[in-house]
């Protein structure tokens, strides 16, 4: 659809005569009839297939024609067409004399014709005005013409319909050739697809308007490139949604079981070496001079009573020194210069000679010990505390301070491993000598019944349109991750697609 525009510029009829040679009375009151038709190899009479138009009387004899387009007038003349512009045409322009006011063809005598031109033309759409001049012996007509497309029509022959829009069906303007030019932030054949925030993950993110990034279920972050781990996951990560892959040193379904107490809590003091020995369990190996479960106690080297035979111990920077009583010598006062005659046995100990009296041995009463019965018995020396318990002297008695997980006088009893309810998903816990065992209900397995074996919400393929299914282990449900163009809890609904010609 377009318009053939004809601009009449000047008509010269100096002698004021008709085509027959007869003069007009009083002058030639001139108007024009225009016929536009298909291109003919030889211009021939026939219907004006592309349209006709007539002007009012524009002047007498010779005159210039005013450009009247701005005032809504009739110059240029408009010949609209509703077909593909063929590029060639035949144009006939007749100049007529109007003796009266009635300009209808049937009201005029046939000899009222002043002049007639008929040309074959070639004209592309949107070309600049093409100027032409036709001269005869009596008249001259100067005119120009062009073809423009109607509103919303584009292309070389005005055949492409394009209507700019900014709504659900598209966001575009039209290029001169009729192709769509998407508004900023939109893409696709009809510019219906928003361009999401730069970097927004292609599969895991989407948008309903430009520069947006909305995450599909199971994804988060500004660009929807971070998966959401399993609900309750404490010390774990994911590579796909609802996973809980434990960080190093953590275990369990929710990665909340500490398998590396040493690293996470550094319980051993004074430079001791820490060794993990199970969940929340560890052993400290103390450096010399330290003791205690966590090596928190500084140990005096004299505390072990290294001096024998009543020698007194003195702490030194680099160890200790024994001050021996008379009759003894050696690093620990272990060598005697005494015999039974010297009554060396204290605390009621009996003396027995050895090696023909060159040496002796004391037999000590209960509660005393030492080569001279000089020491009260230390009830802790026999390490009576089991499972790494710490022995403490309390006057005549002793007691054991147990490590976590043990109890009893000598720390010989395990605290029940089952007390913490370690079995997941309703598993039954059994205490064993060195640990525990879980008996799992149907559908679960693993040391702690943490592995789901048979109940899989995704097993029935509930998601449509090639969506990805994820099982939410905490709720026994599934989540569908929809591909582009589908919505709904099962991705069953297509997003409304445009008809092929949305306008």
């Amino acid at each position: 659809s377009g318009v053939f525009q004809l601009q009449l510029q000047e008509f010269i009829n100096e002698r004021g005569v008709l085509a027959s040679g007869r003069p007009c009375e009083p002058g030639c009151r001139t108007f024009f009839r225009v016929c536009l038709k298909h291109f003919q190899a030889v211009v021939s009479p026939g219907p004006c297939t592309f349209g006709t138009v007539s002007t009012p009387v524009l002047g007498t004899n010779s005159f210039a024609v005013r450009d009247d387009s701005s005032g809504g007038g009739r110059n240029p003349l408009q010949l609209p067409f509703n077909f593909t512009w063929p590029g060639t045409f035949s144009l006939i322009i007749e100049a007529w004399h109007a003796p009266g006011d009635d300009l209808r063809p049937e009201a005029l005598p046939p000899d009222a014709l002043i002049s007639k031109i008929a040309i074959q033309g070639s004209l592309a759409v949107g070309q600049n005005w093409l100027l032409d001049e036709q001269t005869s012996t009596l008249t001259r007509l100067r005119y120009s013409y062009r073809v423009i497309c109607s509103d919303n029509y584009y292309g070389d022959n005005c055949s492409r319909l394009c209507k700019k829009r900014n709504d659900h069906f598209g966001h575009y303007v039209c290029q001169p050739d009729g192709n769509l030019s998407c508004l900023p932030g939109w893409t696709g054949e009809y510019c219906q697809q928003p361009i999401c925030l730069s970097g927004c993950h292609e599969q895991n993110g989407y948008c309903s308007k430009p520069a947006e990034c909305l995450c599909r279920p199971g994804w988060q972050g500004r660009l929807c490139n971070e998966c959401i781990p399993h609900n309750g996951c404490r010390h774990g990560t994911c590579s796909t949604p609802w996973q809980c892959t434990c960080d190093e040193g953590w275990g369990g379904l929710f990665c909340d079981q500490d398998l590396n107490y040493c690293t996470h809590h550094s319980p051993c003091k004074n430079g001791a070496t820490c060794s993990n020995s199970g969940q929340r369990s560890y052993t400290c190996t103390c450096r010399p001079g330290y003791t205690g479960v966590d090596c928190e106690l500084e140990l005096s080297e004299c505390d072990s009573n290294p001096c024998r035979n009543g020698g007194s111990c003195k702490d030194q920077e680099d160890g200790y020194h024994c001050l021996c009583p008379p009759g003894y010598y050696g690093l620990h006062c272990e060598h005697s210069t005494l015999s039974c005659a010297d009554s060396p046995c204290f605390n009621g100990g009996s003396c027995r000679e050895r090696n023909q009296g060159a040496n002796y041995a004391c037999e000590c009463p209960p509660n005393f010990t030492g080569s001279n019965c000089e020491k009260k018995v230390d009830r802790c020396t026999s390490n009576p505390c089991a499972n790494g318990g710490q022995c403490l002297n309390r006057g005549p008695s002793r007691m054991c301070r147990c490590r976590p997980g043990f109890t009893g006088t000598y720390c010989e009893l395990h605290v029940s491993d089952c007390a913490r309810n370690p079995c997941a998903h309703g598993g039954t816990c059994h205490d064993l000598e060195n640990g525990l065992m879980c008996t799992c209900p149907a559908g679960f397995s693993g040391r702690r019944c943490e592995v789901r074996t048979s109940i899989d919400a995704c097993a029935s393929s509930p998601c449509f349109n090639r969506a990805t299914c994820y099982t939410d282990l905490s709720t026994d449900t599934f989540v569908c991750n929809c591909p582009y163009g589908f919505v709904g809890s099962r991705c069953e609904f297509p997003v409304g697609l445009p008809p092929s010609f949305p306008w």
């Epitope: 003919q40 190899a41 030889v42 211009v43 021939s44 009479p45 026939g46 060639t88 035949s90 006939i92 007639k116 031109i117 008929a118 040309i119 074959q120 033309g121 070639s122 032409d132 036709q134 001269t135 005869s136 012996t137």
Partner: antibody, heavy 118, light 107 residues
């Protein structure tokens, strides 16, 4: 008096060129589309080429396309036909004509003979 | 291309006879057809254009009719000067095409 006078014909060997001219008088040459029409000895009429009044449109019959060129000089009221790579089958009397039946115009020249022979 | 089939190719008639020559186009050419008369050694002369319009100066015994694809030239009463070859020409589309001609001879 309207006149169209062709010139430039003659005998020429195959593959050679000729340029025909048509001088117009007695009418406004620049107003009309012009045609070259030929007639082989003892045969019917055959259209050859066309040029519009302003020279913007040209058409040729398939057998001469790429070999013949029609042109016009409105200031000299003259029509031309440049014929290259001539063939024996181009032998004919060549007429120029101004045809515009809408205006009742039908002017023909008497023709010029072109003979292509080795 | 539009083919123009003219018949008959030759015709013998006498002065005073009514003669009809036909031309058929291979596709619709509306009324864009002309009839020409040609005498030996002369340029063709236009008789009828736009299928039925008589060219100025042509005797009224010549008439044309038809539109679309079928056209007729009629000479109502043959005169001695009418013995010649007659051609139809379609002016609708390029290439312009002529009928093969009808040679009208004296019987």
């Amino acid at each position: 008096e309207v006149q169209l006078v062709e010139s430039g014909g003659g005998v020429v060997q195959p593959g050679r060129s000729l340029r025909l001219s048509c001088a117009a008088s007695g009418f406004t040459f620049s107003n009309y589309g012009m045609y070259w029409i030929r007639q082989a000895p003892g045969k019917g009429l055959e259209w050859v080429a066309f040029i519009s009044h302003g020279g913007g449109i040209t058409y040729y019959r398939d057998s001469v396309k790429g070999r013949f060129t029609i042109s016009r000089d409105n200031s000299k009221s003259t029509l031309y036909l440049q014929m290259n790579s001539l063939r024996a089958e181009d032998t004919a009397v060549y007429h120029c004509a101004a045809l515009n039946w809408e205006l009742g115009i039908d002017y023909w020249g008497q023709g010029t003979m072109v003979t292509v022979s080795s | 291309d539009i083919q123009m089939t003219q018949s008959p190719s030759s015709l013998s008639a006498s002065v005073g006879d009514r003669v009809t020559i036909t031309c058929r186009a291979s596709e619709d050419i509306y009324s864009n057809l002309a009839w020409y008369q040609q005498k030996p050694g002369k340029a063709p002369k236009l008789l009828i254009y736009a299928a039925n319009r008589l060219q100025d100066g042509v005797p009224s015994r010549f008439s044309g009719s038809g539109s679309g694809t079928d056209f007729t030239l009629t000479i109502s009463s043959l005169q001695p000067e009418d013995f010649a070859t007659y051609y139809c020409l379609q002016g609708s589309k390029f290439p312009l095409t002529f009928g093969q001609g009808t040679k009208l001879e004296i019987k």
